[in-house]
């Protein structure tokens, strides 16, 4: 990582190629002495947003000039250069780009196929040569019985009542990511997966519509797991454990219905799906799936622009959006986020140059690519600059898919951001009904965990950077994502008030940026993790008899939780006692806050083998949910319970929590060592 020399200090910013040498933003004559207050900034932001035509930008980004824009394609690059130029026009402190060489999977010239065969493997008929594909599928041909597993969740497989080993599984799109569906099927020794969109959940008129997705249970380039895919790295060939070892293919609804015509058994009524749905292929029929996808190396570009903070430029909030899209449909998937990114960048540039806004901390605007392959661009950047970002990037705000409807405002975030999000929801009005976005004091219980296919996930689970993703959406999935029907026209049809909805999303993101970069005290509520820890300990407590039987005790875990609680209380007291004008003291206190999320990354697993190290939100046996899952097995099925693993899990979880408590306490002489 290059260092950017400032006048006074050296700020490390993650970049690879400088494209602008301007050191500070050009500002008009504005009185710098008068500090703008939250109320002024809120009003200022709102007024600026009122004058912007978001929908026009989204429409422009969805037109032929920039579509289709598969990662690394010519149109993806040309949009990257357009964004780069815009950032220059906004007179950012610095604009740069980040180049990676990544492996993505594309369809081969040989068509993928789904065929019905008889028991002797003789062709009965071709069901479909699908138009879509699933990136990172295994390229293979498999033949077997076809079994419907609803959405392919773990519970769906448990409820199936029929083994799927040696069978191809057909699942509905939705509920969980393609990668999770495939991993669940593969764990039960299924030999292939077909994914379709049923009409009940995805009310699309065109039954022949194909769609796209990826099957990597992870993020980033799966052939450089845990490390960056720069062209000059000397890492030996590697492969993510999240790659499937079975073929996966998306099929149209029409193809699924042809398959159902050769299947038997009514799908359970509680699935609430199409009446045509059937469960298993007739005994005389099998399905043959051929996937011939190939790997291609592509150069991808992430584009960055920074507004440097006036007091703590080496502390930054990152605001990002996905630029690419698989297939021709781009509107809801990447044009809304990219359009919003550009307009927010313009607004903040304006507020600084014309209105006297002086953010204390820096704001990085990032345009990622290869998002459709599993947040590849964002993850590669994180992998490349993990050490540079540590204790510097303190929040990630994801702008992807922020408007997919109007009915609900949904949030997925680190608990550190719950309090701030709650305040902003109380402040911001819904453009349709005029009521505040804060509808329910119990909203936190409805917060969904960030999923693998969200670019915010690697920030939180891999890098330990608090992250937030939000959307205006319906209860039902937006039906056109990943299809060629994800057009501007379709989006405006689904969301007639598109401009107002995006404007409101901009207000939420804008207020977040202001609160996080302007306030002296960092707006990250570290006390929120107390209830997360309490909830975990409560869950674990149900099994105290089992734990006792193994000769183990929860005493040390209680102690670690107690230490964390006391550390948060002490920090709150320290903030209360601190002189807010004492920058040095405030920075030291804020640094302690910034450590919280990072210290929930398990130090006991390798980022290469288990990149998502976060014990609450990560993935792998080191996580607290995995510990509980393992322990649950002791009651259900002693054979599946791994006691040696559990003993390790409990010890390491305890010490990770203790470590987080210690880090929050501050200096080594402040740590209670009676553990």
């Amino acid at each position: 990582c290059k260092r950017v020399e400032q006048k006074e200090e050296c700020v490390k910013l993650a970049e690879t190629e400088e494209t602008d040498k301007s050191e500070t933003m050009e500002t008009e004559d504005v009185p710098t002495s008068s500090r703008l207050y939250w109320a002024d900034l809120k009003t200022l932001l709102s007024e600026k947003l009122n004058s912007i035509e978001f929908a026009d930008t989204i429409k422009q980004l969805s037109q032929n000039t920039y579509t289709p824009r598969e990662a690394g394609s010519q149109k993806d690059e040309s949009l990257a250069y357009y964004i780069e130029n815009q950032f220059h026009e906004f007179k950012f402190s610095k604009v740069w780009r980040d180049e990676h060489y990544v492996k993505i999977q594309v369809k081969d010239s040989a068509q993928n196929s789904v065929i019905i065969v008889d028991k002797n493997g003789r062709l009965v008929y071709l069901v479909e040569n699908p138009g879509g594909y699933v990136a990172y599928s295994k390229a293979a041909t498999v033949t077997g019985k076809l079994v419907h597993a609803n959405f392919g969740t773990k519970k769906d497989f448990e409820d199936l009542y029929t083994p799927v080993n040696g069978s191809i599984v057909i699942v509905r799109a939705g509920k969980i990511t393609f990668a999770e569906k495939v991993a669940n099927a593969e764990s039960l020794n299924a030999i292939g997966v077909l994914i379709y969109m049923d009409q009940t959940k995805f009310p699309i008129v065109n039954a022949e519509l194909s769609f796209f997705g990826h099957a990597h249970l992870g993020t980033g380039d799966p052939y450089t797991p845990g490390f960056p895919s720069f062209n000059h790295t000397q890492f030996p060939p590697s492969r993510s454990s999240g790659l499937p070892n079975i073929p996966v293919q998306t099929i149209s609804r029409a193809a699924a219905e042809k398959l159902f015509g050769n299947m038997e058994g009514d799908c359970p009524s509680d699935w609430k799906t199409d009446s045509t749905c059937r469960m298993v292929t007739s005994e005389s029929k099998n399905v043959k799936l051929t996937v011939s996808n190939v790997l291609k190396e592509r150069r991808i570009l992430n584009i960055f622009g920074v507004i440097k903070g006036y007091e703590e430029p080496d502390r930054y909030v990152v605001v990002g959006a996905q630029r690419d899209a698989l297939g021709a449909g781009v509107a809801a998937k990447s044009s809304v986020g990219t359009g919003l990114l550009l307009k927010l960048a313009q607004v903040f540039s304006d507020m600084i140059s014309k209105d006297g806004f002086r953010p204390s901390r820096s704001i990085i605007f990032a345009s990622w690519t290869a998002g459709d392959f599993g947040a590849v661009g964002a993850t590669e950047w994180l992998e490349g600059y993990l050490s540079s970002l540590h204790l510097k990037a303190f929040t990630y705000i994801n702008l992807d898919k922020v408007v997919l409807g109007t009915s609900n405002f949904k949030v997925s975030a680190s608990p550190l951001l719950y309090t701030l999000m709650g305040k902003i929801m109380q402040d911001v009005k819904h453009p349709v009904d005029g009521k505040s976005l804060y509808r329910d004091s119990n909203w936190i219980s409805k917060v969904e965990k960030l999923s693998f296919d969200n670019a915010a996930y690697p920030f939180l689970a891999y890098s330990g950077i608090p992250a937030v993703s939000f959307c205006f959406c319906e209860d039902a999935d937006y039906p056109y994502l990943g299809t060629r029907l994800d057009t501007y026209e379709a989006l405006t049809q689904k969301v007639p008030q598109l401009n107002q909805m995006v404007r409101t999303a901009a207000e939420v993101a804008g207020q977040l940026i202001i609160k996080l970069t302007h306030d002296v005290e960092l707006n990250l509520d570290y006390e929120r993790y107390n209830s997360q820890l309490l909830s975990f300990v409560r869950d674990l407590n149900q099994y105290r008899a089992d734990i006792k039987e193994m000769g183990l005790s929860l005493q040390w875990l209680y102690s670690a939780r107690g230490d964390f609680f006391r550390a948060t209380s002490r920090l709150t007291t320290d903030f209360g006692n601190a002189e807010k004008t004492d920058r040095f003291v405030m920075k030291k206190l804020n640094d302690r806050v910034m450590r919280v999320e990072y210290h929930f990354l398990s130090p006991y697993v390798s980022p290469k083998e288990s990149p998502f190290r976060h014990v609450f939100w990560g993935s792998g046996s080191h996580t607290l949910p995995a510990l509980l899952e393992n322990l649950k097995l002791r009651k259900q099925n002693n054979g599946a319970f791994n006691e040696t693993l559990f003993r390790n899990q409990l010890a390491l979880a305890t010490w990770t929590i203790q470590g987080a408590a210690n880090a929050l306490s501050g200096d080594v002489w402040d740590i209670d060592n009676e553990f």
Epitope: K119, Y161, T162, E264, G265, D266, S275, S282, S284
Partner: antibody, heavy 122, light 109 residues
């Protein structure tokens, strides 16, 4: 313990009606296709009717079509056979039988009830 | 409808002997859709073979099924005393109605 218990048989006059029930236990009833099979005294087996696991599909032997109706109540784990316009040739022991594999409509029957006798006589 | 004809009507054999039962269909039946049952007096039928050759759970390996198209066979390699019963074949491959054969009685010689 997987079990099927038929009930509802008895003496009925020609032209009369009868409703047979089959109570299932020990397995996930809603995942299995169910059949009715009958056997006249001293005669062979005759397939009567089939109903898919969710009750969506039903089929009948030509000899009972239009007179018999098969149904199921998955919440009660019970299979039914409504028999109308009964004839002397319908006199038999009626067995309910479970498909040998979950979900499949066309498969052998691996679990049978003990049967209930239907006597059609004036 | 498909008519299944079983032969012989009665088979008289001694314990330890091999029994070969035939089931002939009036038109072709997919081998996936043929089953064999055993029924003893006063009892419900018991599934022996499904899919023409797959043994049902708990069925001893002396029972085996074979055949395709219109000709199917049930073989009992060594008759045990408990094997003396009536055996039925059933097809469920065509569109319903599904049909049983008239049965073959295996009796002690």
């Amino acid at each position: 313990y997987v079990q099927l218990v038929e009930s509802g048989g008895g003496l009925v006059q020609p032209g009369g009606s009868l409703r047979l029930s089959c109570a299932a236990s020990g397995f996930s009833f809603d995942k299995y296709t169910m059949n009715w099979v009958r056997q006249a005294p001293g005669k062979g087996l005759e397939w009567v009717s089939v109903i898919s696991n969710g009750g969506v599909s039903t089929d009948y032997a030509d000899s009972v079509k239009g007179r018999f109706t098969v149904s199921r109540d998955n919440s009660k784990n019970t299979l039914y056979l409504q028999m109308n316009s009964l004839r002397a040739e319908d006199m038999a022991t009626y067995y309910c039988a479970r498909a040998s594999q979950p979900w499949l409509y066309r498969t052998g029957a691996d679990v049978w009830g003990q049967g209930t006798l239907v006597t059609v006589s004036s | 409808e498909i008519v299944l004809t079983q032969s012989p009507g009665t088979l008289s054999l001694s314990p330890g002997e091999r029994a070969t039962l035939s089931c002939r269909a009036s038109q072709s039946v997919s081998s996936s859709y043929l089953a064999w049952y055993q029924q003893k007096p006063g009892q419900a039928p018991r599934l022996l073979i499904y899919g023409a050759s797959s043994r049902a759970t708990g069925i001893p390996d002396r029972f085996s099924g074979s055949g395709s198209g219109t000709d199917f066979t049930l073989t009992i390699s060594r008759l045990e005393p408990e094997d003396f019963a009536v055996y039925y074949c059933q097809q469920y491959g065509s569109s319903p109605p599904w049909t049983f054969g008239q049965g073959t009685k295996v009796e002690i010689k």
